[in-house]
């Protein structure tokens, strides 16, 4: 990153070089020589989504005009280092990881957007972005400081499978019970139906006062 600043100063100062001593011009011309190191930047912390997906940007300051770039994601946990995934791409082309890779990514200039999926709590660790400028020579290597990815597994309900079975059984029982009740009620109503009924509301006076509560004051005959 600093290298870009040095080059910018060089461009601005070159306007005035005619009035400056040759030694200064010589010095300015050679400033870029001290800026060859490649620097890689990535976020310090990222929290994975509840679905176990984490995304972060890996940005590098390219010292040369690279046409072939290799990006590798390394995981460091308990001083153990493992390669998570890697992809080589041509500048201007899309970044493609292997089919079985847990990583996907897109590239835009000197920036790579990385997505790691299928993460679980045990995958929490430092994920380091390693960038290599493969072609043309010379080869350049840059390694980021790492992104600490935190993965929290979603808390499952206690005995969720068991509760699901209970819920299914109760629901099924209620459904069949209501089905049976409806069937019985309908059959009783059909038996009681008189062939003389016209389908209008008819006032039914009680025959015995003490039994009044056993009958509805109105009923709707069903055709």
């Amino acid at each position: 990153m600093a290298c870009l600043g040095f080059q910018r100063h060089k461009a601005q100062l070159n306007l005035a070089t005619r009035t400056w001593p040759c030694t200064l011009l010589f010095f300015l011309l050679f400033i870029p020589v001290f800026c060859k190191a490649m620097h890689v930047a990535q976020p310090a912390v990222v929290l994975a989504s509840s679905r176990g997906i984490a995304s972060f940007v890996c940005e590098y300051a390219s010292p040369g005009k690279a046409t072939e770039v290799r990006v590798t994601v390394l995981r460091q946990a308990d001083s153990q280092v493992t390669e998570v995934c890697a992809a080589t791409y041509m500048m201007g082309n899309e970044l493609t990881f292997l089919d079985d890779s847990i990583c996907t990514g897109t590239s835009s200039g000197n920036q790579v957007n990385l997505t790691i999926q299928g993460l679980r709590a045990m995958d929490t660790g430092l994920y380091i972005c390693k960038v290599e400028l493969m072609y043309p020579p010379p080869y350049y290597l840059g390694i980021g400081n790492g992104t600490q990815i935190y993965v929290i597994d979603p808390e499952p309900c206690p005995d969720s499978d068991f509760l699901l079975w209970i819920l299914a059984a109760v629901s099924s029982g209620l459904f069949f019970y209501s089905f049976l009740l409806t069937a019985v009620s309908l059959s009783k109503m059909l038996k009681k139906r008189s062939p003389l009924t016209t389908g209008v509301y008819v006032k039914m006076p009680p025959t015995e006062p003490e039994c009044e509560k056993q009958f509805q004051p109105y009923f709707i005959p069903i055709n």
Partner: antibody, heavy 118, light 108 residues
Framework: QVQLVESGGGVVQPGSSLRLSCAAS????????MHWVRQAPGKGLEWVAV????????HYADSVKGRFTTSRDNSKNTLHLQMNSLRAEDTAVYFC???????????WGQGTLVTVSS | EIVLTQSPGTLSLSPGERATLSCRAS???????LAWYQQKPGQAPRLLIY???SRATGIPDRFSGSGSGTDFTLTISRLEPEDFAVYYC?????????FGPGTKVDIK
């Protein structure tokens, strides 16, 4: 544990050729870049060459460019250094070394001595 | 190529003393791409520090590395008898990779 064993060293005449080999074990050979580093008697370390994990890329020190070629056989866990047009100044102990994930050399073999003398 | 210069050439110290070794690069080196190695007579080198300041597996915490840009330092806080050896710095950020000429730490 990681083991690297070099072989093929010996005494040769200037202008002749020699092929060094390095047998690797104790790690996934096909996942690591491999280096050759040499050390002239009583002198310091000099980096010679590197080959990528899959053999796709190779880089050499200016002093050996065009004369030395490194190759690898991942099926046999073996690394090679073909040395042509040997000079007296190529006399050294040649170390085979593993490239770590972070790019540095993390494990070394014990070395094999190459003497170029008439 | 990047030229690495180490100083001093020889460092004469007693066990228990602090050793400070310097490595200077001819041009800027990414701090993530500088390593330190220890070599004892008749043995292969051993990785001590990588990425300028990260200790390799199994390296005691008396060894520490620091620096950035063109100036890097290896510090041995308290010299143990087994620490008397030659120390090399190496840059692996730009090809060709290069080693420094080494600093010999010997017993005073």
């Amino acid at each position: 544990q990681v083991q690297l064993v070099e072989s093929g060293g010996g005494v040769v005449q200037p202008g002749s050729s020699l092929r060094l080999s390095c047998a690797a074990s104790g790690f996934t050979f096909s996942s690591h870049g491999m280096h050759w580093v040499r050390q002239a008697p009583g002198k310091g370390l000099e980096w010679v060459a590197v080959i990528w994990y899959d053999g796709s890329n190779k880089h050499y020190a200016d002093s050996v460019k065009g004369r030395f070629t490194t190759s690898r056989d991942n099926s046999k866990n073996t690394l090679h250094l073909q040395m042509n047009s040997l000079r007296a100044e190529d006399t050294a102990v040649y170390f085979c070394a593993r490239g770590g994930y972070f790019g540095c050399v993390d494990y070394w073999g014990q070395g094999t001595l190459v003497t170029v003398s008439s | 190529e990047i030229v690495l210069t180490q100083s001093p050439g020889t460092l004469s110290l007693s066990p228990g003393e602090r050793a400070t070794l310097s490595c200077r690069a001819s041009q800027s080196v990414s701090s993530s791409c500088l390593a330190w190695y220890q070599q004892k007579p008749g043995q292969a080198p051993r990785l001590l520090i990588y990425g300028a300041s990260s200790r390799a597996t199994g390296i005691p915490d008396r060894f520490s590395g620091s620096g950035s840009g063109t100036d890097f330092t290896l510090t041995i806080s308290r010299l143990e008898p087994e620490d008397f050896a030659v120390y090399y710095c190496q840059q692996y950020g730009i090809s060709p990779f290069t080693f420094g000429p080494g600093t010999k730490v010997d017993i005073k």
